[in-house]
């Protein structure tokens, strides 16, 4: 660092002396009361060929000194007056000091009725004093003088001293406000320091500091520390900053110049929208988080979230951060689409790129329906099994079951239902179901029962009599049977074109009709089977009933 200035002291300690008197100058360095090594003396800029730390002078002018451990002292102006009356001030004098003024006559014994003046006005209570004290002097351009009466033989002659401008030294330097940055970035810390320097000749003086923005006091007001740490600066902290330093006794107060501090707002850049779950693939009912972030940007950032096709924003957040989140609870199918976010901390928002959100919907319970050519399915019919979930994101895989046996599967790539075709056989009767699966969990349909009805085959009519030949009085059994056909089957029995009667068979084995034979029962017999899918006629069987002996009766 720079070596401290040397200090020039006077002995006697008055800056004005009479011509012919001697004044001792002492060069003192702050590090040592007296200088060590060579001391350089200058009188009106001229190097004097004396190297002691103490010199005697008789010539007026500006004196300076410099020691090995210090830099050049401030100039001290010493006056040697040829006048009869001089006003002396103690040297050194600092701002705020109570300074002693002494009115001296060349022949002081014959000088009386001394009066002291400041700027032409008599100082109060200053009449006929050898010395007076002027309280708390400042560095103004006040001029002091004194008057006195000089005895000249028997006369008293009034004499006036030359005006004295007291060399008041600064007790401490005018403060300078230093900021760690004059254009801090919003959100960054800043240190303000109220810099001053106390005169090394007055190390015991205690100073206090206060810092201001515009007219507002910062921190806790007066403090013994010249430093104030502001943890984070915001745009509203921009303004005119200054500081004050004063002695703790309030005798001297000094104010720094104002420093304009503009808090710089870093415009937002690189706005990014991120969606959780990552990738923007959601299942209906899940929660979605839209995270809007900026790579750079300071201060208060307004984030907003937008969806394509929606005029109003989904939400807005204003906060001092580089990231904000918007929570969308239990997403619905309608939440699918393209999203972007915007961030703004200056004048116009910066937009992120679009991000697509897909909301996948689990399949609902599918509904199984039969599509057939007729209400009652018949063997040979083409049956279409149609399975459909009314909700669910494609692709949906449908599986078809008959009595828990997988018949097959069919995919619906773009939604809707799927069909499976069967050419019906009698075995296809039973319970059918389907399930739907789009990867978000399979759902089962209710079971649907199918009855495949079989048309009756051509019945066979057989006549059963006790003997080989039908004889009057025999009990004849007409038996009609279709070997195929869904029950119930209604069997009709005919003699010639007369209906003998009908019998319903609810299970296999056909149906029988009994006749007690008479001769009139001879003739052609037939039967018919009908289960509602079309009647089938048997072949005609001829019966010959004989009225004589049993062994002559025959069947053809």
């Amino acid at each position: 660092g720079v070596a401290p200035k040397a200090v020039l002291l006077l002995n006697p300690p008055w800056s004005t002396a009479f011509k012919g008197e001697k004044v001792a100058l002492i060069c003192s360095s702050i590090s040592h009361s007296l200088a060590q090594g060579d001391t350089y003396w200058y009188h009106d800029e001229k190097l004097l060929k004396i190297k002691h730390d103490k010199i005697q002078i008789t010539e007026p002018g500006n004196y300076q000194c410099k020691t090995r451990g210090s830099s050049l002292s401030d100039a001290v102006h010493v006056e040697f007056s040829p006048d009869w009356l001089i006003l002396q001030a103690l040297h050194p004098v600092f701002e705020g000091d109570n300074v002693i003024l002494r009115c001296q006559g060349k022949d002081n014994k014959n000088t009386h009725q001394k009066v002291y003046y400041k700027d032409g006005k008599q100082l109060p209570n200053s009449y006929n004093l050898e010395k007076i004290t002027v309280n708390s002097v400042s560095r103004d351009n006040s001029k002091y003088h004194c008057t006195a009466y000089r005895k000249f033989y028997i006369l008293d002659i009034e004499v006036t001293s030359k005006p004295l401008n007291i060399q008041v030294q600064e007790l401490f330097l005018h403060p300078v406000l230093r900021a760690s940055s004059s254009t801090p970035i919003e959100g960054s810390p800043m240190t303000l320091t109220c810099e001053t320097q106390l005169s090394p000749q007055r190390p015991d003086v205690q100073l206090q500091f206060s810092l201001f923005r515009d007219s507002q006091t910062l921190g806790l007001g007066w403090s013994r520390s010249p430093r104030l740490q502001i943890p984070a600066m915001w745009t509203e902290d921009s303004g005119s900053y200054w500081c004050e330093v004063e002695t703790v006794t309030h005798s001297i107060k000094k104010r720094s110049l104002r420093s304009q501090i503009r808090v710089q707002r870093v415009p937002v850049s690189n706005v990014n929208l991120e969606i959780r779950p990552t990738g923007g693939q959601l299942i209906e009912g899940e929660n979605m988080v839209l995270i809007c972030s900026v790579a750079q940007g300071s201060g208060t950032v307004t984030f907003s979230w937008h969806k394509e096709g929606r005029v109003r924003s989904l939400g807005r957040k204003t906060q001092r951060s580089l990231l904000a989140e918007l929570h969308v609870l239990t997403v619905k199918e309608s939440d699918a689409g393209r999203y972007y976010c915007a961030a703004d901390n200056v004048h116009s928002p910066i937009l992120s790129t679009w991000i697509r959100v897909t909301v996948r919907i689990p399949v609902s319970h599918p509904v199984l329906t039969f599509r057939a050519p007729r209400a009652h399915t018949v063997v040979g019919d083409l049956l279409e099994l149609h399975c459909e979930s009314l909700r669910g994101s494609p692709p949906i895989l449908y599986r078809f079951y008959h009595e828990d046996v997988t018949l097959g599967n069919s995919s619906a790539p773009s939604g809707g239902g799927a069909s499976f075709n069967l050419s019906l056989t009698a075995e296809h009767s039973g319970n059918y179901s389907c399930d739907a699966d789009n990867g978000l969990g399979a759902q089962h349909s209710h079971g649907v029962s199918l009855r495949v009805t079989v048309p009756v085959s051509r019945p066979v009519l057989t006549l059963r009599a006790p003997g080989a030949q039908a004889v009057v009085g025999d009990l004849l059994e007409l038996h009609c049977e279709s070997l195929r056909g869904s029950f119930p089957i209604l069997y009709w029995f005919y003699h010639e074109d007369d209906t003998l009667g009908n019998i319903s068979a609810h299970s296999g084995g056909g149906a029988s009709f009994n006749l007690s034979l008479t001769t009139e029962h001879s003739g052609n017999y037939s039967c018919e089977a009908d289960n509602g899918l079309g009647a089938q006629h048997s072949k005609v069987v001829t019966l010959n009933v004989t009225g004589t002996s049993r062994n002559r009766t025959g069947l053809t």
Epitope: E45, K46, L47, Q64, D74, E170, H174
Partner: antibody, heavy 116, light 108 residues
């Protein structure tokens, strides 16, 4: 009468060095500091450095980072300033001046032109 | 570093006018402030030392005042020979001296 006589104008190439002089008369040479000042065309004044002819002690403007070197020849009451690694920025009038705190007497100036 | 700021940059006056030139230091420099005059194609000339001390050979119409950070050079009744550039210089942090940017005093 105090007089400071400076050497004549210099035209030098970029990258070269130059040494100019200032001869003092009319006072005791070793009693007063000598200063050097630069004045670019139409601009203000910039202090370069001080030399104490009594003991050769030098002080330089910290901003100029070794651009100048000041020397003294007591036998001829002359101070010298050498400027090195010259660029067009060094084209200016250079004054020597006597004084400790202020610049009481000035030389007539030396014009330096640096050509590329 | 101590910066010295002079104002105004240019001052247009008529002979006979009285003018004040300002010099402001970036920090307190006590009375360690000196004023110079430089006429066209001439070397500068010392006018005032230590803010207010006069220099022998300089006309009494030139006077200086101020202390700390604000200083003034006053010319009482400008004469035609006074036109030119005026510079202030601080010597507070010896030996690092700095000059102000200058004020041009010109004929109106």
């Amino acid at each position: 009468e105090v007089q400071l006589q400076q050497s004549g104008p210099e035209l030098v190439k970029s990258g070269a060095s130059v040494k100019m002089s200032c001869k003092a008369s009319g006072y005791t040479f070793t009693d007063y500091y000598m200063k050097w000042v630069k004045q670019s065309h139409g601009k203000s004044l910039e202090w370069i450095g001080d030399i104490n002819p009594y003991n050769g002690e030098t002080f330089y403007n910290q901003k100029l980072k070794g651009k100048a070197t000041l020397t003294v020849d007591k036998s001829s009451n002359t101070v010298f300033m050498q400027l090195n690694s010259l660029t067009s920025e060094d084209s200016a009038v250079y004054y020597c001046a006597r004084g400790l705190y202020f610049f009481a007497y000035w030389g007539q100036g030396t014009t330096l032109t640096v050509s590329s | 570093d101590i910066q010295m700021t002079q104002s105004p940059a240019t001052l247009s006056v008529t002979p006979g006018d009285s003018v004040s030139l300002s010099c402001r230091a970036s920090q307190s420099i006590s009375n360690n402030l000196h004023w110079y005059q430089q006429k066209s194609h001439e070397s500068p000339r010392l006018l005032i030392k230590f803010a207010s001390q006069s220099i022998s050979g300089i006309p009494s119409r030139f006077s200086g005042s101020g202390s700390g950070t604000d200083f003034t050079l006053s010319i009482n009744s400008v004469e035609t020979e006074d036109f030119g550039m005026y510079f202030c210089q601080q010597s507070n942090n010896w030996p690092q001296y700095t000059f102000g940017g200058g004020t041009k005093l010109e004929l109106k």
